[in-house]
Structure formats: structure tokens, C-alpha cells
């Protein structure tokens, strides 16, 4: 009976032609980095760089590794036990309600508002009303509404006096 060896434990030269290691399920479940065989008697390792499983499972198939879209950078590659981690490129962000794509961050705040938060890979710039301090809804303003320090140049935080 073979030991529980996942493919990320193998030397890089061995990964080029992945061997699907087998072991026996424990109480009907297979460890992370594996899936269960059709007859339920074996645990089969996921294919390094192609698919993965993160938990003890009785899945028939490992899950496909995510491929980062254009406009994303790969923070960490897919292993047999962890999916790829992708992040939006600088100047773009991913919203919770539209996770399938990175959107461009706004370059400035609407008139009468001041920027209090920068563009990050997970959030747009944050704008608040100068007087009340309440947050802006996040709707992209029309070009002519954007506060600018000179025609066509978005204001930087320090150019707004508050």
C-alpha cells in the first residue's frame, strides 16, 4: 500500500510527467490533494498545476485550477492542495457583486467630495462628502463632474483643501 504522497512534495523534475499516486481512503475520505476512485477503494492524487482539492473529500474529480484572466496577476500558482491566487492589476479592482472581472478604478472623486481611500485590487477609490463625511455610492461620475486640479488632470488627494 503506497504512502500518502501529494505531487507538490515531489521534486520539480518529477512533476513534468505527473504520476498519479494512490493510497487508501480513511473512513471513505481522501486527503487534500487527492480525489476518490470510482470504486471508492483508492485515493488518487490531483495533477499538479492542473487540478486540486483543499479538504478531505469523497470527490470523484479534483477541481480545475483557476487560470488568471488578462488584467490579473498570479500571486501564487495552483498546487494539488491550493487553487491559483489571482489579483487585479494595479489601477483595477474586483467588486463582490461582479467577481468575474477587474474594473478600472476611478481617477477622481465627484465635485464636492474628497478622496479618503486609494484604489486597491479589491476596492475602488473611496470618496466622502467634504462637509458631512458620508461615503459616495461608488457610481462612476460623468467626466464633467470629476473634480480636477487642472483641465483633464484628476486631482490628487493633497490638491484638495477640504
Amino acid at each position: 500500500e503506497s504512502a500518502l504522497i501529494t505531487q507538490q512534495d515531489l521534486a520539480p523534475q518529477q512533476r513534468a510527467a505527473p504520476q498519479q499516486k494512490r493510497s487508501s481512503p480513511s473512513e471513505g475520505l481522501c486527503p487534500p490533494g487527492h480525489h476518490i476512485s470510482e470504486d471508492g477503494r483508492d485515493c488518487i492524487s490531483c495533477k499538479y498545476g492542473q487540478d486540486y482539492s483543499t479538504h478531505w473529500n469523497d470527490l470523484l474529480f479534483c477541481l480545475r485550477c483557476t487560470r488568471c484572466d488578462s488584467g490579473e496577476v498570479e500571486l501564487s500558482p495552483c498546487t494539488t492542495t491550493r487553487n491559483t491566487v489571482c489579483q487585479c492589476e494595479e489601477g483595477t479592482f474586483r467588486e463582490e457583486d461582479s467577481p468575474e472581472m477587474c474594473r478600472k478604478c476611478r481617477t477622481g472623486c465627484p465635485r464636492g467630495m474628497v478622496k479618503v481611500g486609494d484604489c486597491t485590487p479589491w476596492s475602488d477609490i473611496e470618496c466622502v462628502h467634504k462637509e458631512s463625511g458620508t461615503k459616495h455610492s461608488g457610481e462612476v461620475p460623468a467626466v464633467e463632474e470629476t473634480v480636477t486640479s487642472s483641465p483633464g488632470t484628476p486631482a490628487s488627494p493633497c490638491s484638495l483643501s477640504g
Epitope: I36, E38, F61
Partner: nanobody, 124 residues
Framework: EVQLLESGGGLVQPGGSLRLSCAAS????????MSWFRQAPGKGLEFVSA????????YYADSVKGRFTISRDNSKNTLYLQMNSLRAEDTAVYYC?????????????????WGQGTLVTVSS
């Protein structure tokens, strides 16, 4: 979002063959494992067969092993079920489903989508 549409069902004599198709819309077809389930009149849902995202790993229920063949064409976003040596007990509505994976018991893992079903009747 994935939308699934089955076709190919119909009336066939015992011993005959049918090929079911399941056309998927949406660019994420290749990210998902795919499967066929069936529901016979007055019975519960039965897990029939499944195939992984790349098409190189398959599963069959004992009741259809050796008679049914599951396959997928990722370039056409289509799943197939070739059914040979059909029996009266194969009569059912056949549904295709997609999920990140499936457990041995047929439980979908992660986000999953289902078609509307196609009726297969095996009768002389």
C-alpha cells in the same frame, strides 16, 4: 452563469441505442465537471454518470456500466451520453448537470447548474 439544454431523448425499443446531448452556454464550460442524472416515473433522482473538466476521468453507476458512455467536446461546449443495449428500466427523464465536482453519491460540489431534462422511453 451556465445554461444547459438537453436533447436526443425519445422512444426506443429494448436493445436499441440513443445519444443524448447537453449543450452549455457560457464561457466557463471547461471549468466544470459534468454529469447525467435520471428520474424514472415515481422514483427519486439517480446519479448515472459523470466526467471531469478535461474529459480524461469518468464515473458510471453500476446499473449502466458497460452500456453507457459519457463524453464531452469542450470545443463545442457539449456533453454527450451514448446509451446502448437499452432496457425498460432505463426509461426516465435524463438531466445533465454541471458542478466543480461530484461526490461518489452524486452530490454536486460548489456552484452547480441543471438542465430541464429530456425524456427517454424504452418500450416495445
Amino acid at each position: 452563469e451556465v445554461q444547459l439544454l438537453e436533447s436526443g431523448g425519445g422512444l426506443v425499443q429494448p436493445g436499441g441505442s440513443l445519444r443524448l446531448s447537453c449543450a452549455a452556454s457560457g464561457r466557463t464550460f471547461t471549468n466544470y465537471a459534468m454529469s447525467w442524472f435520471r428520474q424514472a416515473p415515481g422514483k427519486g433522482l439517480e446519479f448515472v454518470s459523470a466526467i471531469n473538466w478535461s474529459g480524461d476521468s469518468t464515473y458510471y453507476a453500476d446499473s449502466v456500466k458497460g452500456r453507457f458512455t459519457i463524453s464531452r467536446d469542450n470545443s463545442k461546449n457539449t456533453l454527450y451520453l451514448q446509451m446502448n443495449s437499452l432496457r425498460a428500466e432505463d426509461t426516465a427523464v435524463y438531466y445533465c448537470a454541471s458542478a466543480e465536482s461530484f461526490s461518489r453519491g452524486g452530490l454536486p460540489y460548489g456552484m452547480n447548474y441543471w438542465g430541464q431534462g429530456t425524456l427517454v422511453t424504452v418500450s416495445s
